[in-house]
């Protein structure tokens, strides 16, 4: 049925889903917390611009009785009985901001007809690219997958001679929302990551993974896991690992290895961490001085969302432009927007680009060093420590195949 | 209440250069881009640049090549430098906060500190 | 980028009096505009922005008005401390560009 948007006559609202099912296990109050904040923003920024209108947001929550996993296992069709819920009420903001599980977003997005703009926290996984109306404000799986192509072809830095063309994959079916789409990209036959390396396989058991880390026959010194030191160690342990083991270790939306008390454990010595640069301007934030660090990144993408759609609307109502057209519907991206901690850049298909930063721990000093930060906006790797203290041979990255000479 | 000081150095050779800190007492530092705005004697503002708390700069292409400016956050102030000064930067420097977060308006000024360039 | 241009360079007022002063842009800012006053050894004070919103503490007199490239800035009945340099300035586009202001002095 045809459902009116709320979006008109200095009136513009926006619908908030609150979704049981999430990708990070977040209070809604916490959520609603930051949309309200976000809110305070734009009106400010709205009125500075001399644009006196009504902004406001409609919280959307699902009944939580049958889907209740808590989890995004059971999202896909909680994210529809809200697009009901919606429709039974006939009425709709300018904008949908909320679906963060990959499996809800894909399929509202399936099922809707898409002539409203749709934010997401989340919805990293690659069946979420190149939807034309859906903006992502959390780094998706396909920018880990550049990174990662860009790094093993890299072979000019003074710490990376040589190029790789191989890698396991660590992945148990435990991960995280971010982690499960992250390596299910690197793990699919299709994609480009897959398709950029001649061998890749996945280890699926503990002891798969341990006993890789003494294997003289194994086909790749290079091993791609996701989640945090604890996680590394519960599989890892204080097990001995060959000198020319790599492990990578992704942990985006984490900013602890930036705190200036934090040492890093000896079983990190021959892990690099890929994470995002930190943002620091949420800790006085009145929504998230109880958040993890992980959750603060969850939170800021909601409330960078909101900070989007002021952005759009501000545009749109200098020019004079209808909000309630496909022209609006389709804007959001290939844009930078001024978020709560500075200029947010889209990119061409709505996706946020970030500064991930590759992380080595010094043998000197105990202490997570940056090794190089890569731009996702641009594709390029920027070298930051030439001369970096590896526990790797001549504090050189070994070749990714043992006993391979110089390519 | 949020105060501005600025200090630096007020008289200049042509080719030095110009060093000018502000420190911000008060509210927030980091819900904010922090401005440089200059005025030469009996003449109109012209703005120089901003920086948030980031880093994240936004400067005057008329003066960009010349101009640098930074933060320290871990003290709530930040910094100007003008490279290679002659005469006709000879003005008073004023820093400034605008009134919120890319509003770009300015609610709270330094004292200002009149820098003279002559040889 | 935007120039502003205001007029008169020079406005001589009786106390009582109203004062109309008058801001243009090259290029349309929208309401993107802020009026600003400043007495002699002082630094400027914000009196207005969004073309028409009082800055906090700013007496009823002033008013704002304008849209696009053509703004004024309005002074109900001149006190003798409004006699000052007043400016305007624009906010929608870097680099942000003042006007090169407008004297008003007692006649």
């Known amino acids: 049925s045809q459902v009116s948007q709320n979006c008109h006559n200095g009136s513009y609202e926006i619908s908030v889903l609150m979704m049981g099912n999430s990708a990070f296990a977040e209070p809604l109050k916490n959520l609603e917390d930051a949309v309200n904040e976000g809110l305070e923003i734009v009106r400010g920024r709205l009125q500075n611009a001399g644009l006196n209108v009504t902004v406001n947001a409609t919280f959307m929550y699902s009944d939580g009785l049958i889907h209740n996993s808590g989890d995004c296992r059971s999202s896909t069709c909680e994210g529809l009985d809200l697009l009901r819920k919606i429709s039974n009420a006939q009425r709709m903001g300018c904008v949908l901001i909320g679906p963060s599980c990959t499996y809800s977003t894909f399929q509202m997005y399936l099922d809707t007809e898409l002539s409203y703009p749709m934010i997401s926290a989340g919805s990293f996984g690659l069946s979420c690219d190149y939807k034309e109306t859906l903006t992502r404000l959390m780094s998706p799986a396909r920018k880990l997958m550049y990174f990662l192509v860009n790094f093993w072809k890299t072979n000019d830095l003074p710490f990376k001679t040589y190029s790789w063309s191989t890698s396991y994959v660590y992945k148990n079916g435990t991960e995280t929302e971010d982690c499960f789409w992250y390596l299910n990209a690197l793990e699919a036959s299709v994609s480009y990551f897959s398709h950029e390396l001649g061998f890749k396989v996945v280890l699926r058991q503990d002891k798969e993974f341990q006993d890789i880390l003494m294997d003289h026959n194994r086909k790749s010194n290079v091993i791609i896991m996701c989640g945090g030191p604890e996680f590394l160690y519960k599989l890892k342990g204080d097990r001995a690992v060959a000198e020319d083991i790599v492990i990578i270790l992704v942990d985006l939306f984490n900013d602890q290895y930036f705190e200036d008390n934090v040492t890093a454990p000896d079983y990190m010595k021959n892990v690099l961490v890929l994470t995002l640069s930190p943002g620091n301007s949420l800790l006085n934030s009145s929504f998230s001085r109880n958040l993890s660090p992980t959750k603060r990144d969850f939170a800021l993408a909601y409330l960078n969302g909101i900070l989007l759609f002021g952005h759009m609307l501000k545009i749109f109502l200098e020019n004079g432009e209808n909000i309630t057209t496909p022209k609006f519907a389709h804007a959001f991206r290939n844009l930078t927007f001024e978020g709560y901690d500075g200029p947010v850049t889209l990119d061409d298909w709505g996706d946020v680009d970030s500064t991930m930063v590759l992380l080595y721990t010094s043998v000197d000093t105990k202490k997570y060093k940056v090794l190089l930060t890569y731009d996702t906006h641009v594709n390029k790797t920027y070298p930051v420590d030439m001369s970096p203290t590896f526990t790797w041979k001549n504090s050189k990255l070994p070749n990714d195949i043992t006993g391979r000479g110089p390519q | 209440q949020v105060q501005l000081q600025q200090w630096g150095a007020g008289l200049l050779k042509p080719s030095e250069t110009l060093s000018l800190t502000c420190a911000v007492f008060g509210g927030s530092f980091s819900g904010y881009y922090w401005s440089w705005i200059r005025q030469p004697p009996g003449k109109g503002l012209e703005w120089i640049g901003e920086?948030?708390?980031?880093?994240?700069?936004n400067d005057n292409p008329s003066l960009k090549s010349r101009v640098t400016i930074s933060v320290d956050t871990s003290k709530n102030q930040f910094a100007l430098k003008l490279s290679s000064v002659t005469a006709a930067d000879t003005a008073v420097y004023y820093c400034a906060r605008e009134r919120g977060y890319t509003y770009g308006n300015y609610e709270h000024w330094g004292q200002g500190t009149l820098v003279t360039v002559s040889s | 980028e935007i120039v502003m241009t205001q007029s008169p360079a020079t406005l001589s007022v009786s106390p009582g009096e109203r004062a109309t002063l008058s801001c243009r842009a090259s290029q349309t800012v929208n309401r993107n505009l802020a009026w600003y006053q400043q007495k002699p050894g002082q630094a400027p004070r914000l009196l207005i922005y969004?073309?028409?919103t009082r800055a906090t503490g700013i007496p009823a007199r002033f008013s704002g008005s304008g849209s696009g490239t053509e703004f004024t800035l309005t002074i109900g009945s001149l006190q003798s401390e409004d006699f000052a340099v007043y400016y305007c300035?624009?906010?929608?586009?870097?680099?942000?560009?003042f006007g090169q202001g407008t004297n008003v002095e007692i006649k």
């Open positions: 969004g073309a028409s």
């Open positions: 300035q624009q906010y929608k586009t870097w680099p942000r560009t």
């Open positions: 920086i948030n708390h980031r880093g994240n700069i």
